[in-house]
């Protein structure tokens, strides 16, 4: 996160860290807890690393440096990448992770509410992006979970800034005209959440941007409302009956 500040314990209890353990262990992506056994993240996090066994998912944590060999983590039972995601294109950048064992909810570990299907009418004015990603383009992973308040921008405005790319209605953009605040490398898959009527909702999944926090280059996020049918279909067909945190 560029231009952010330290988060507090329990402030973003749905935020998880997706880490890979090969020879060493490192944080690669963020994710959002959306049910006892489900995490929503970006499909591109799994490019080149599709093996379930190498992943460790840490929930209910604030500081990555607090993680030791004794820190509990979740393992992956199943990775469900959107069927239309292609490595060569970058559309449909969304994936579900089914955990091997359900998580108990606590003050520091609980799910984020999902938006209503096709939610286009809600005007979100209080939106935040969180993660342990770089604090500048040529930076490094941060220890303490960072947060930053960023306004949504219209898809029309976003398209003007990315003329070489197609900004679809299944994407949502956020950023300041002058730059300075944005997600960055390592924040991928993490949440863009907005507070509306006193409730936090998962509006976007951190996907991509041109550099980080550059002027007139907003961050691009996968629009969760556009994938509600897919999320419900996958979680229900796998669970029998899903236990999603939906506002409706």
């Amino acid at each position: 996160i560029v231009g952010g500040t330290n988060s507090s314990w329990g402030e973003w209890p749905w935020q998880v860290s997706l880490q890979v353990k090969l020879t060493a262990q490192r944080h690669l992506c963020g994710g959002s807890l959306i049910g006892h056994q489900w995490v929503l993240t970006a499909a591109h996090c799994f490019d080149g690393l599709p093996l379930q066994d190498v992943w460790r998912i840490y929930s209910g944590i604030l500081n990555l440096s607090d993680i030791t060999k004794d820190t509990p983590f979740s393992q992956i039972k199943e990775i469900i990448i959107h069927q239309n995601y292609k490595v060569s294109e970058g559309n449909h950048d969304i994936a579900l992770i089914k955990l091997q064992a359900p998580l108990n909810y606590t003050e520091f570990q609980k799910p984020i509410c999902l938006p209503s299907k096709g939610d286009t009418s809600t005007i979100y004015t209080n939106c935040w992006v969180t993660g342990w990603g770089f604090s500048k383009e040529k930076g490094e992973i941060q220890n303490i979970l960072q947060k930053v308040n960023i306004p949504l921008v219209t898809n029309e405005e976003c398209q003007k800034r990315y003329q070489d790319y197609k900004i679809t209605q299944r994407m949502v953009c956020a950023g300041y005209k002058e730059g300075g605040k944005d997600a960055c490398k390592g924040d991928s898959g993490g949440p863009l959440v907005c507070k509306h009527n006193g409730m936090w909702r998962l509006v976007g999944i951190t996907s991509w941007g041109e550099g980080c926090a550059r002027r007139e280059q907003p961050g691009v996020y996968t629009k969760v409302a556009e994938y509600m049918d897919w999320i419900l279909e996958k979680t229900q067909s796998s669970d029998g009956k899903a236990q999603m945190q939906s506002p409706a």
Epitope: E89, Q163, D164, G186, S188
Partner: antibody, heavy 125, light 108 residues
């Protein structure tokens, strides 16, 4: 299976014109940025031009700017390169390539993931 | 323009040996925009590595890419007969997109 097939090459005199085509199949052509790359005999690869998926944005190498025009017809799944005022130094095998643009580490990746077999353009009197 | 300088110009190695090819850029290049291609005589180039370190589909794991900023490396851990040819690095970070002049890997 992704396939790119160039055509239109041949022998042309200096100052002459030629139009290359690249027929694409096996993927949704209108989703992809496309590019032309050339290779003079016995030399390395040189990027020539690219065009955005809609065709609305084009960029050229300085060596061909003002003489070459890249275009596309998404309804025909075809990429074109109109070459005017040809010079001897334009002699090369011309390849069309698909430009893949995925996402990695919250940034776009850009690379040429599929290439045609090439068409030879010879500029000589 | 970003200049790409590859070294060595030619590498003479025997099958089974390790090949290390270098690519230096004149300006900082985001790793995501650095690719390596292989070309054998009479053939079109073939994508090997994208994003500086990700292997393209169907590329064997003896090929690996590393690097950051201005220094990038392609390594072939054990040369196979089909690996002989010319290797090019290429950047798409800024237009004009540019290629290195190539490194020829020949049989010793």
């Amino acid at each position: 299976e992704v396939q790119l097939l160039e055509s239109g090459g041949g022998l042309v005199q200096p100052g002459g014109s030629l139009r290359l085509s690249c027929a694409a199949s096996g993927f949704t052509f209108s989703h992809y940025l496309m590019t032309w790359v050339r290779q003079a005999p016995g030399k390395g690869l040189e990027w020539v031009s690219y065009i955005s998926p809609s065709g609305g944005h084009t960029i050229y190498a300085d060596s061909v700017k003002g003489r070459f025009t890249i275009s596309r017809d998404n309804s025909k799944n075809t990429l074109y390169l109109q070459m005017n005022s040809l010079r001897a130094e334009d002699t090369a095998v011309y390849y069309c390539a698909r430009v893949a643009r995925g996402i990695a580490a919250r940034s776009r990746t850009v690379y040429f993931d599929h290439w045609g077999q090439g068409t030879l353009v010879t500029v000589s009197s | 323009d970003i200049q790409m300088t590859q070294s060595p110009g030619t590498l003479s190695l025997s099958p089974g040996e390790r090949a290390t090819l270098s690519c230096r850029t004149s300006q900082f290049v985001n790793s995501n925009y650095l690719a390596w291609y292989q070309q054998t005589p009479g053939q079109a180039p073939r994508l090997l590595i994208y994003g500086a370190s990700s292997r393209a589909t169907g590329i064997p794991d003896r090929f690996s890419g590393t690097g950051y900023g201005t220094d990038f490396t392609l390594t072939i851990s054990r040369l196979e007969p089909e690996d002989y040819g010319t290797y090019y690095c290429q950047q798409s970070s800024r237009t004009p997109w540019t290629f290195g002049q190539g490194t020829r890997v020949e049989i010793k």
